[in-house]
């Protein structure tokens, strides 16, 4: 990636890291308003299976692993990217390495959920306070989950699907920060590990993933009012280990693995028309990216 100053533009979709033949250090940003991609400063260490989030206008890359010809190292790292300076800086590491992690943000705090370290599949969850540069463990999930999808709705943290070390999961659970406790919610219609999970219009969406046999293109959403999961239009491509984010009322899914190919495809979901469309391609195919959108 280039080391010059990043252009000072509005909301961009950032994609960090990923995997194609080995873990990647790319940081790229897509501008949906003009369809362009920016090549930004590389991660200091390549990683896949990471998660991305934005707090206070800064992009954070959380966990993952560096799968390279030199070896395979699960990551406990938290790194912070400043779009104004186009530079990465390390923050305090998590208590344990977490590959195929899920993250969510509540009240400016980053929650790191599940993931794996070698053969250990975590149910542990920890919270990062940026102002103190500190991590603290909170209540563990009821289920061990890697490849877990995480989303925040109404200041509640949802952990959806994943893999517990033996089985891929359709179960989901919700964390209540005030009570520091997890409760199960209605299970999805479909087993999904490595799905893309996000929030749009008071619903939690779970897109794609892997059911233990095949990659999926199906998409379902959870209505917190009715506590039910309902299918919406499927994506054009089957994909697991995909990136997902929401930009201006639309869902974007990036890359992933379809069982044969590492996808460069980026699809966009319009909830008004219940349709998916191909909007762009990443500069190369990859799975296991971390994705987030800058704030205004």
């Amino acid at each position: 990636g280039s080391m010059g100053h990043a252009p000072k533009v509005g909301r961009l979709i950032y994609t960090a890291g990923g995997y194609f033949r080995q873990s990647l250090s790319y940081l790229e940003a897509y501008n949906p308003s003009d369809g362009t991609w920016l090549d930004l400063a590389d991660l200091q260490v390549p990683r896949s299976g990471l998660a991305g989030c934005v707090v206070g206008g800064l992009l954070y890359a959380v966990g993952g692993r560096n799968n390279s010809p030199d070896g395979n190292t699960d990551s406990s790292a938290l790194d912070c990217y400043n779009p104004m300076t186009n530079q990465w800086s390390p923050c305090a590491p998590m208590s344990v390495p977490r590959n195929r992690i899920g993250v969510g943000v509540i009240d400016g705090h980053i929650y790191a959920v599940g993931g794996s370290h070698g053969c250990i599949h975590h149910n542990s969850v920890e919270r990062y306070e940026p102002e103190r540069d500190e991590w603290h463990l909170v209540a563990p999930m009821l289920t061990r989950r890697i490849g877990v999808g995480v989303a925040v709705l109404n200041r509640l943290l949802y952990a959806v699907g994943g893999f517990d070390g033996t089985n891929r999961l359709n179960s989901a659970e919700c964390y209540y920060p005030e009570r520091n406790e997890w409760r199960m919610i209605t299970a999805m219609n479909t087993i999904r590990s490595g799905a893309g999970v996000c929030v749009l219009h008071n619903c939690i969406y779970a897109a794609g993933g892997y059911d233990g046999q095949d990659q999926l293109n199906s998409v379902e959403r959870y209505d917190v009012e009715t506590e039910t999961w309902t299918f919406v239009a499927p994506m054009k491509h089957r994909r697991s280990a995909l990136g997902i984010t929401v930009h201006q009322g639309r869902i974007y899914v990036l890359g992933g693995y379809d069982g044969h190919t590492f996808l460069d495809s980026v699809e966009c979901y319009d909830p008004d028309t219940d349709t998916w469309s191909e909007v762009t391609r990443m500069t190369s195919g990859r799975s296991g990216v971390g994705v987030a959108v800058t704030m205004e």
Epitope: Y19, G49, N67, C119, G165, D214, A241, Y257, G259, S287
Partner: antibody, heavy 119, light 107 residues
């Protein structure tokens, strides 16, 4: 019945290439990680490579990284090991194995195929 | 890489004997250890996973145990078909590694 059948072994000169195949039946390779494990004559077992069906990620032993490539074709229910820049120390019986429901334990193995690297 | 040191490298025993094979990990591997049996010219067969869980279809005379970083495979009453080479394997961290093997021979 779960079965794995390797093929493609043989005699090759140092620096040469071979492609091993592992044909699966009785289960879908899209549902399991597939590994290659080798055994030099009269020696013990050495893990070589694996491919994850969910993420597509591959892992390699340091001794073969950059020279060997594992892949899978789910439509043929077959896994492959492309071996380039072969060395005398790569001489071994190569087994493909299925990862069971427990991380990196192998609950089904092929019969093996012998690769001999010699001039 | 984690080393799995297996002992003894070979042993002689009679049918009906109780046989114990040990494997010591060079660092903690939790319970992520498996045991395999291999006969000449054949592929290995899984006996034990997660240090002490008996794999489906394996006779109950085989058992596994863990004490810290020491792992033990026990055959309670050796049968004629049990003469073979046995390997331990750790899958706790990358790369997965095997012990050097223990050959169980007829006395």
């Amino acid at each position: 019945e779960v079965q794995l059948v390797e093929s493609g072994g043989g005699l090759v000169q140092p620096g040469g290439s071979l492609r091993l195949s592992c044909a699966a039946s009785g289960f879908a390779i899209s549902a399991s990680s597939i590994h290659w494990v080798r055994q030099a004559p009269g020696k013990g077992l050495e893990w070589v490579a694996s491919i994850d069906p969910e993420t597509g990620e591959t892992l390699y032993a340091k001794s073969v990284a950059g020279r060997f490539t594992i892949s899978a074709d789910t439509s043929k229910n077959t896994a492959y090991l492309q071996m380039n820049s072969l060395r005398a120390e790569d001489t071994a019986v190569y087994y493909c194995a299925r990862e069971g429901k427990w991380w990196a334990y192998f609950d089904a193995w092929g019969q093996g195929t012998l690769v001999t690297v010699s001039s | 890489d984690i080393q799995m040191t297996q002992s003894p490298s070979s042993l002689s025993a009679s049918v009906g004997d109780r046989v114990t094979i040990t494997c010591r990990a060079s660092q903690s591997v939790s319970s992520a250890v498996a045991w395999y049996q291999q006969k000449p010219g054949k592929a290995p067969k899984l006996l034990i996973y997660s240090a002490s869980s008996l794999y489906s279809g394996v006779p109950s005379r085989f058992s596994g145990s863990r004490s810290g970083t020491d792992f033990t495979l026990t055959i309670s009453s050796l049968q004629p078909e049990d003469f073979a080479t046995y390997y331990c394997q750790q899958s706790y961290s990358f790369p997965s590694t095997f012990g050097q093997g223990t050959k169980v021979e007829i006395k």
